[in-house]
């Protein structure tokens, strides 16, 4: 109970040039603390200094990357200080260019199934880190496979549950500077589908339209979905609309597609605001075909 707890806010992964707050918390409420860095480059602003409650560190440079501990003031201890805290590893991003992050077979994963997250780069990274947004625990460390064109890692994730769904990013690093990371990959939203019953999808004025004609796709369900998501087969991304309660007791969203030039297979999903990465089963596919246009898909 005398050992303090060190944490980093908003997290341990910090972009170069940004700030991070190191907070040393004593379970007995002693507010003053000292900070030490165990590895990497020295950080002069830590030495012979007493901090109170927290320390705003930055603008962060690669020199700030490394392992930190704190000791809290402790009037009952012979030295006046507590035992050292837990270690906190600060990783600085933006030192190398960003890798790419993909999901195979895709980012919409059926509940209970497995998805492979692939992080790759034309830089020869010996290590990759996989990080989920909103999680304060350390990112997952993965060993990269090196090849002539660069490096990559495949991470098999599953069985899929709402707890695993979320926004992922990956980073690359080299062995001799393990806490200096690349810029983050573009975010990848992994969504678990099949948690609730499927909504129904219909088209107004109908699923077959003249080229240039307006069409609206309506997604509806008796489930209390807050949000509907419309996706087109073989296209990344989706349209998203808030559900509206209709007189007939259904929750509906109308997606105006505007003047259409070519068709495709559409599906929609329902979800709740509280669990944005957990979606329903897909609606039955709705083929929208466009006449008077050589391209139907």
């Amino acid at each position: 109970q005398d050992k303090p707890f060190l944490s980093a806010w908003p997290g341990t992964v910090v972009s170069e040039g940004q700030h991070v707050t190191l907070q040393c918390r004593s379970r007995l409420g002693f507010n003053e603390f000292s900070l030490s860095k165990e590895d990497g480059m020295p950080v002069p602003e830590l030495y012979n200094r007493i901090f109170r409650n927290s320390f705003l560190m930055g603008p962060v440079t690669p020199a700030h990357a490394g392992t930190y501990r704190c000791c809290s003031s402790h009037p009952h201890s012979p030295t006046g200080w507590s035992a050292p805290s837990n270690p906190v590893v600060i990783m600085v991003t933006g030192v190398h260019r960003k890798p790419s992050l993909l999901a195979h077979p895709g980012p919409l994963v059926k509940s209970g199934e497995t998805v492979i997250l692939q992080c790759w780069s034309d830089v020869r990274f010996e290590r990759f880190l996989l990080h989920r947004e909103g999680i304060t625990e350390d990112p997952l460390r993965l060993v990269g496979q090196l090849h002539d064109a660069g490096s990559q890692v495949n991470y098999s994730m599953g069985p899929m549950t709402p707890a695993l769904a979320g926004t992922y990013r990956c980073f690359g690093s080299v062995t001799h500077l393990p806490y200096e990371l690349s810029a983050p990959s573009d975010p990848l939203d992994i969504v678990v589908v099949g948690l609730y019953g499927k909504p129904s999808l219909s088209a107004q004025p109908g699923p077959t339209v003249q080229a240039g004609e307006n069409v609206t796709l309506s997604c509806s369900s008796r489930s209390l979905f807050d949000i509907y998501h419309l996706s087109r087969e073989a296209e990344a991304g989706e349209l998203r609309l808030t559900a509206v309660l209709r007189v007939n007791g259904t929750f509906q969203a109308n997606f105006p597609l505007g003047p259409v030039t070519h068709g495709g297979n559409y599906r929609c999903f329902g979800s709740f605001r509280a669990l944005p990465h957990a979606w329903s089963d897909p609606s039955d596919p709705l083929p929208v075909s466009v006449t008077g246009n050589s391209r139907h898909l």
């Epitope: 109970q1 005398d2 707890f5 918390r25 379970r27 007995l28 409420g29 009952h76």
Partner: antibody, heavy 122, light 97 residues
Framework: QVQLQQSGPEVVRPGVSVKISCKGS????????MHWVKQSHAKSLEWIGV????????NYNQNFEGKATMTVDKSSSTAYMELARLTSEDSAIYYC???????????????WGQGTSVTVSS | LLVSAGDRVTITCKAS??????VAWYQQKPGQSPKLLIY???NRYTGVPDRFTGSGYGTDFTFTISTVQAEDLAVYFC?????????FGGGTKLEIK
């Protein structure tokens, strides 16, 4: 289940001392620090201090230094708080409360005793 | 605060200096001890209904009851446990019409 059982109400004369107790059960007593809180009409809730149930180390709110003394008896899983030289301003309900645990750092308090009413009256 | 069942209620709490996210919210019903609802500004404590939410960072914090129910009649306190001595807000009494 976790329980904090406090001693009964006290009606005392000004100038005397009173010692109230708080017995923990349903959990490992020495794993969690114990806080004491005063509730009066005049000042709502006031944090008095915290004690390590493991080794008896303490940290007091300066406003209660010399007024409150916190102790623990590990063998009986009981925390005590003695209030000295009582005046009418000490009339209040006093709560013991266990720190919340579970994620490395123990913040806030999640279990409270039922409170001990102390009335100072001549 | 005088509210009707079904109303949405928001209570605010302002710290005199940054307390990062070290804020807890407690509910105290008449004749009872306080109960922890929210810790770390936004984390709902075990068993607390999801109509209770908290948010904020730094100096400004908010506690919301999305749909007030009759059993929510109580006094609500915020507390900072960033720096000792830990301090409580004066409390907000919620009364149901």
């Amino acid at each position: 289940q976790v329980q904090l059982q406090q001693s009964g109400p006290e009606v005392v004369r000004p100038g005397v001392s009173v010692k109230i107790s708080c017995k923990g059960s349903g959990y490992t007593f020495t794993d969690y620090t114990m806080h004491w809180v005063k509730q009066s009409h005049a000042k709502s809730l006031e944090w008095i201090g915290v004690i390590s149930t493991y080794n008896g180390n303490t940290n007091y709110n300066q406003n209660f230094e010399g007024k409150a003394t916190m102790t623990v008896d590990k063998s009986s899983s009981t925390a005590y708080m003695e209030l000295a030289r009582l005046t009418s301003e000490d009339s209040a309900i006093y709560y013991c409360a266990r720190e919340r645990g579970g994620d490395g750092y123990y913040s806030a308090v999640d279990y409270w005793g039922q409170g001990t009413s102390v009335t100072v009256s001549s | 605060l005088l509210v009707s069942a079904g109303d949405r209620v928001t209570i605010t709490c302002k710290a005199s200096q940054s307390v990062i996210n070290d804020v807890a919210w407690y509910q105290q019903k008449p004749g009872q001890s306080p109960k922890l609802l929210i810790y770390y500004a936004s984390n709902r404590y075990t068993g607390v209904p999801d109509r209770f939410t908290g948010s904020g960072y730094g100096t400004d914090f908010t506690f919301t009851i999305s749909t007030v129910q009759a059993e929510d009649l109580a006094v609500y306190f915020c507390q900072q446990d960033y720096s000792s001595p830990y301090t409580f807000g004066g409390g907000t009494k919620l009364e149901i019409k």
